[in-house]
Interface confidence: low
Amino acid sequence: AVDLTLLANLRLTDPQRFFLTCVSGEAGAGRGSDAWGPPLLLEKDDRIVRTPPGPPLRLARNGSHQVTLRGFSKPSDLVGVFSCVGGAGARRTRVIYVHNSPGAHLLPDKVTHTVNKGDTAVLSARVHKEKQTDVIWKSNGSYFYTLDWHEAQDGRFLLQLPNVQPPSSGIYSATYLEASPLGSAFFRLIVRGCGAGRWGPGCTKECPGCLHGGVCHDHDGECVCPPGFTGTRCEQACREGRFGQSCQEQCPGISGCRGLTFCLPDPYGCSCGSGWRGSQCQEACAPGHFGADCRLQCQCQNGGTCDRFSGCVCPSGWHGVHCEKSDRIPQILNMASELEFNLETMPRINCAAAGNPFPVRGSIELRKPDGTVLLSTKAIVEPEKTTAEFEVPRLVLADSGFWECRVSTSGGQDSRRFKVNVKVPPVPLAAPRLLTKQSRQLVVSPLVSFSGDGPISTVRLHYRPQDSTMDWSTIVVDPSENVTLMNLRPKTGYSVRVQLSRPGEGGEGAWGPPTLMTTDCPEPLLQPWLEGWHVEGTDRLRVSWSLPLVPGPLVGDGFLLRLWDGTRGQERRENVSSPQARTALLTGLTPGTHYQLDVQLYHCTLLGPASPPAHVLLPPSGPPAPRHLHAQALSDSEIQLTWKHPEALPGPISKYVVEVQVAGGAGDPLWIDVDRPEETSTIIRGLNASTRYLFRMRASIQGLGDWSNTVEESTLGNGLQAEGPVQESRAAEEGLDQ
C-alpha cells in the first residue's frame, strides 16, 4: 500500500489551532518513475457534507512529502469530509478523514467501520443532545432509512446493514429530522472486496495474517498497519511517537501522538495513534491494553509486562507476541521482512535459525507463494546458529508475493513470512536527448522515460559512428547528470543508445532505441591579423584584416569583430558572415571612446584564435548643427548660403563643411570646407543653370558635428554649364547689395 497518512489534530477547544497534515513516506514522494509526478493534494470534500462558506483554508507545503491545511475559523468549518491524495500513476491513493462536531446532537460510537464482503455492519449513533424527532440515515448524501425516536436502544440509534458489498462503502450520516446537518453523526463504512482473510481477483489468495490490528488489503494482500506498527505483518512496534510504514515519521509536539487521529489508505480507515483512545484520542490505554485505539490486549505470559505502545515486553529467555515462546524453541533470526530481486535472476536466499536442539540443514525449508518447497543447497553451521542457503530457480513475475522460511525441530517450529518483490529491469522508451554539440564532443541527457521498475541505479550510454560495425563504446554515468561523449570525430554521425539498470544482480535492462547525433564542424585554427583601421566619423570605424595563406580550403564561415570598451565594461560584437570578407565598417560607436579591437574566424559555433588586439581612440563628438541655414540664388551658377553659428559650443570651431547635392540626383554629394570659421556666409560657384540643389552643413571642432537642416535652391536662367561648384566666403555683414 502507499505510505500515506492523514493526521487530524483534535484540540477542538480552538478551531484556529486545528490542522490537518498529510504525510507521504513514499520514496521520492511526488516523483514518478521518470519525472516529477503529481504532488500531494489535501482538500475539504464538499460533495456530501456541505458547510456554510467561510474564508478559504490555507494550504502549506513542506517539500513534496508533507502538506498542511489550516485557517479554520469556526467549529462548523471542521465538520465534514477531508481527503488527501498521494502516490503516482496506478499507486495514486486517496485517504479520507471524517470529522464530527463534538457538540452535535448525535455522535458516532465509532467513526470508521472496516468490514469484509458479506459481513453485517452495525453503525451506532449515540444521543448527545436529545430531540424527540425521527432520525434520518443517509448514505453518501442520499436518503437511506428512517428510525422513529422511540427506537433508540440504550441511548443509541443503530443502523444494521446485512450482507454488505463493496458498493455499500461510503459516508453515512444520522440526523434528527429538521435539525442542522452539522449536528449529524457522520460515519465511514469501508467494505473490503473479499471475505475475511482473503484477497486478490476472485478472492482466492490467503491474507498473511496481519497482526496488531492491521488490515489485509483486498487488492495486493499487503497489511495496512495501524499507526505505530511496521513489518510485513505489522509484527513490529515502532517506538513511542513514531508512525509511517517504516516508523520514519514522528508525531509533532511534546505530547507525542496524543490528540491526533490517523487516517491511512483503505481498507484501514482512521484511528488514534498507538497507546491512545477516546473520541479525541486524548486518553491513554487502560492497563493491559495497547495499540491504536487501545483495541489490543496484552495477555503477557512468563513475566512479560504490558507496554501501551508496543504490547508485551518479554523478560530474558522469552519472546513472541505474548512472551509465550521460549528462547529454546527454534527461532528464525533476523530475516528481512522484504527482499527485492530482478526478473529472471537466480538469487540465493539465506535463512538463519537457532534453537535447542540445534537446527540442521534439512530442518530449514523455503516455501514459495505457489506452494513449491525449496530445500537448502548448503548450510553454514556455527555455534550459535545455522544459516541455510537456498538457490532459487530463475524468477518470474508470479514469484512476487509472500515467501516463508520454516524451521522445524523436536523443540518446536518457527516460521517467518517475508515479501519478495520481483522487479522488471528498466527499458528506455525513448532515445537520449542531445543538449549541445561540438566538433569532438556531444553533451547528452541520458535519462528518459522507461518501462519496468526503478529506481535507476546506473545509466549506460552506448555509442559508435553511424553505419559502423565496430564495437560499441560504453560510458557509465550517474542517473541524474548529463554526460559528455569525448574524443569524437568532427562532422560525424553517431548512433547513441541508453541502457538502464536498477539495483541488484540482473538489474540491467535491454538497450533503448537508437538516435543519430552528429558532431559539429572542426574548429577554425587560423589567426587573423589586423591590417589597419580608419576613423570615418566620431562613431564610425572601418577595419581591415588579413589571414595567413595556407594550402587547402578555408575552414570558416565568417569573422567576429569584438570591440571592448574598458571604461564602461561593455563589449560590442559584430558578425561578418562572409569568410572572404577582409574589411568591415563599424557604426554606432561611442565618440571619444578608447576601444580594444580584435577579430576571430568562426566556423559553426566555434571560434578560432583572436588576432593580436589593436587600440583605437575615436574622436569626441562634434559641435551642434549650425542654425538658420538659408540658400539664395545669385545667378545661373552661384548660390549664396547664410547661417548662424551653433549654440553652446564646447570649443572654438575649426571649420565648416558644406554638403552640395543635385536634388534627385544619383551621384555622390560634394563636400566643401569653409576654412574661415568666423564667417556666416559663403557663395557656392560653378553650379549648373536652372538646377535644383540641396545644401546642408556642419561645424567641426575636434570632430565633425551634427548636420544642419537641408535647404533647397535652384540656380537662375539658362547659362552655360559650369565646370563644377566652388566656394567663396564672406562675412554676412557685407550683404548682397554691395
Partner: antibody
Framework: EVQLLESGGGLVQPGGSLRLSCAAS????????MQWVRQAPGKGLEWVSS????????YYADSVKGRFTISRDNSKNTLYLQMNSLRAEDTAVYYC??????????????WGQGTMVTVSS | QSVLTQPPSVSGIPGQRVTISCSGN????????VTWYQQLPGTAPKLLIY???RRPSGVPDRFSGSRSDTSASLAISGLQSEDEAEYHC??????????FGGGTKLTVL
C-alpha cells in the same frame, strides 16, 4: 534523554582480561539489539559483537571469536563485553551502540562516548 | 584490513561537491543496505545515511547516498568547513556480521 555510557577500560598486559560495561538509559533497553564497535588509534571502525534483545543469540567478528563474550542484563539495563587473552591489536576505543530507531541493520543511531582499552607490556 | 574499501582521504573547497566511494562484495552488499557515519575528531560516530540513501531527521539534505551493485557513494554538496571529519561506510554481511570501511578523511581547504 537516551544515553549509553561505557566503563571498564584501562591498561592491561597481553594475555590479560578486562570486562567492559555499557549502561543504557532513556529507552526500553530489553527491546533492542546491542553492539560493540571498536576503533584502533588512527584507524577505521571495526564491528566486534552483537546480541539479541533476549540474549538468546550472539555474534562475533572473526578477530575476537573464542576470546570475547558479549552478554546483557536486561533488569540492570546493562551490556557487557568480557575480553580474555587480550592482544596488542585489541588496543582501541570500544563503543557500545544500538539502532534504536528501527533503521536498517547496520544503522546505529545511538552511540556511547567510548572507553579506551590499552594492551601493552 | 577493512572489509569495505574507501579512499583514505578526499578534499574540497567550500561550496564544492565531493563524493566518497565505498566498495564491497556480494556477501555484504548483495542484499544488504549501506550506512554512512560521520565522525568528528575525538567524538563518537554519528549516523548520516541509512538504507543506502535515507537521511535521519536532522541531517542536512546536502548529504546524499547512492549505491549500485557492490559499490556505494556518499555525496556532500555545498561543502562547509564543519563537514571536515572522518566518514565511514558500513553494511551487514550474509552471516549477520557487521562490516565497516577503513574510513575517509575529508579535508575542507
Amino acid at each position: 534523554e537516551v544515553q549509553l555510557l561505557e566503563s571498564g577500560g584501562g591498561l592491561v598486559q597481553p594475555g590479560g582480561s578486562l570486562r567492559l560495561s555499557c549502561a543504557a538509559s532513556g529507552f526500553t533497553f530489553s527491546q533492542y539489539l546491542m553492539q560493540w564497535v571498536r576503533q584502533a588509534p588512527g584507524k577505521g571502525l571495526e564491528w566486534v559483537s552483537s546480541i539479541y534483545p533476549s540474549g538468546g543469540a550472539t555474534y562475533y567478528a572473526d578477530s575476537v571469536k573464542g576470546r570475547f563474550t558479549i552478554s546483557r542484563d536486561n533488569s540492570k539495563n546493562t551490556l557487557y563485553l568480557q575480553m580474555n587473552s587480550l592482544r596488542a591489536e585489541d588496543t582501541a576505543v570500544y563503543y557500545c551502540a544500538t539502532r534504536k530507531d528501527g533503521y536498517s541493520r547496520s544503522a546505529f543511531d545511538i552511540w556511547g562516548q567510548g572507553t579506551m582499552v590499552t594492551v601493552s607490556s | 584490513q577493512s572489509v569495505l574499501t574507501q579512499p583514505p582521504s578526499v578534499s574540497g573547497i567550500p561550496g564544492q561537491r565531493v563524493t566518497i566511494s565505498c566498495s564491497g562484495n556480494n556477501s555484504n552488499f548483495g542484499s544488504n543496505t549501506v550506512t554512512w557515519y560521520q565522525q568528528l575528531p575525538g567524538t563518537a560516530p554519528k549516523l548520516l545515511i541509512y538504507s543506502d540513501s535515507r537521511r535521519p531527521s536532522g541531517v542536512p539534505d546536502r548529504f546524499s547516498g547512492s549505491r549500485s551493485d557492490t559499490s556505494a557513494s556518499l555525496a556532500i554538496s555545498g561543502l562547509q568547513s564543519e563537514d571536515e571529519a572522518e566518514y565511514h561506510c558500513a553494511a551487514w554481511d550474509d552471516s549477520l556480521n557487521g562490516v565497516f570501511g577503513g574510513g575517509t578523511k575529508l579535508t575542507v581547504l
